[in-house]
């Protein structure tokens, strides 16, 4: 994870929940202690884990970049979901940036698909 939230909003209770590992693993929303005796809860809005694990650290929540909107906030078991703002989209080959959608089709072409956060408009040649 390259984008990390450095100013988390902590909604969890001050005391971190603890339980015992099962077969050396801790459940989603937790990480394992250094002595493998406890499962320590991730901090809401700060970090998370999505599956059974033996992580020494929970994973850091992604912070949406400018030009992105937060669709789902980070929980202890799920990372933040960020989406490109309206009028922009994320390309598969350059997923780190949101690019502006084209405003229209070239002459001789018609729009068959609108801009979405995942794709540019789609144009096809006019039937002659």
């Amino acid at each position: 994870i390259t984008r990390q939230s450095l100013d988390p909003q902590r909604r969890a209770a001050p005391q971190q929940k603890r339980s015992s590992p099962t077969e050396g693993l801790c459940p989603p929303g937790h990480h394992i202690s250094e002595d493998s005796r406890e499962c320590i809860s991730c901090k809401y809005g700060q970090d998370y884990s999505t599956h059974w694990n033996d992580f020494l650290f929970c994973l850091r929540c992604t912070k949406c970049d400018s030009g992105e909107v937060e669709v789902n906030s980070c929980t202890t078991t799920r990372n933040t979901v960020c989406q490109c703002e309206e009028g922009t989209f994320r390309e598969e080959d350059s997923p780190e940036i949101c690019r502006k959608c084209r405003t229209g089709c070239p002459r001789g072409m018609v729009k068959v698909k609108d801009c979405t956060p995942w794709s540019d408009i789609e144009c096809v040649h006019k039937e002659s």
Partner: antibody, heavy 117, light 108 residues
Framework: EVQLLESGGGLVQPGGSLRLSCAAS????????MSWVRQAPGKGLEWVSA????????YYADSVKGRFTISRDNSKNTLYLQMNSLRAEDAAVYYC??????????WGQGTLVTVSS | EIVLTQSPGTLSLSPGERATLSCRAS???????LAWYQQKPGQAPRLLIY???SRATGIPDRFSGSGSGTDFTLTISRLEPEDFAVYYC?????????FGQGTKVEIK
């Protein structure tokens, strides 16, 4: 009594490889996360890598990521650090330490790695 | 990464005097994940304090740790000849684990 004994250090050319070992005794090795910490001559301490008790999770400093690999053999109570593509700046005393986050409560005596042509 | 800045770089004191060493973090560190170490020339570091204020096994009570958030302090109430060494703070809140650059306590 907890004991950590490093070995495997030595002189290596830039671009070369070394494998460090740390033999542990006096505690339930497989239960504890372990780390490697290094100290260049006349410099401060630098954390290098860490591994969970089971060996399922590993962590690295950016300076060694992609070149060093930490591993452990719990049946032999031994921690390893495979160091590839060694650079002059990797020259240091390498310490094996018990723990990762809250404390490094036991340290080995260190093994010296020299990188020079 | 969390940067730990120790001050002063060098502390020149006489045996019997009080030493106060500071460790400042670039962002908040939970007290649970702040430790102090002592290192003498040619030796491995030795754990002094963990959890910001808990003394490690066998550490004399002249050593004490305090602080929270971004400011932590190691205090040696009365310096003994064997206390002249380099002291490091360390955080384990976030990866990568980081150490301060060290404070050398030398004989005046």
């Amino acid at each position: 009594e907890v004991q950590l004994l490093e070995s495997g250090g030595g002189l290596v050319q830039p671009g070369g490889s070394l494998r460090l070992s740390c033999a542990a005794s006096g505690f339930t090795f497989s239960s504890y996360a372990m780390s490697w910490v290094r100290q260049a001559p006349g410099k401060g301490l630098e954390w290098v890598s860490a591994i969970s008790g089971s060996g399922g999770s590993t962590y690295y400093a950016d300076s060694v990521k992609g070149r060093f690999t930490i591993s452990r053999d719990n049946s032999k109570n031994t921690l390893y650090l495979q160091m590839n593509s060694l650079r002059a700046e990797d020259a240091a005393v390498y310490y094996c330490a018990k723990g990762v986050r809250k404390k490094f409560d036991y340290w080995g005596q260190g093994t010296l790695v020299t990188v020079s042509s | 990464e969390i940067v730990l800045t120790q001050s002063p770089g060098t502390l020149s004191l006489s045996p019997g005097e009080r030493a106060t060493l500071s460790c400042r973090a670039s962002q908040s560190v939970s007290s649970s994940y702040l430790a102090w170490y002592q290192q003498k020339p040619g030796q491995a570091p030795r754990l002094l304090i963990y959890g910001a204020s808990s003394r490690a096994t066998g550490i004399p009570d002249r050593f004490s740790g305090s602080g929270s958030g971004t400011d932590f302090t190691l205090t040696i109430s009365r310096l003994e000849p064997e206390d002249f060494a380099v002291y490091y703070c360390q955080q384990g809140q976030l990866p990568p684990i980081t150490f301060g650059q060290g404070t050398k306590v030398e004989i005046k």
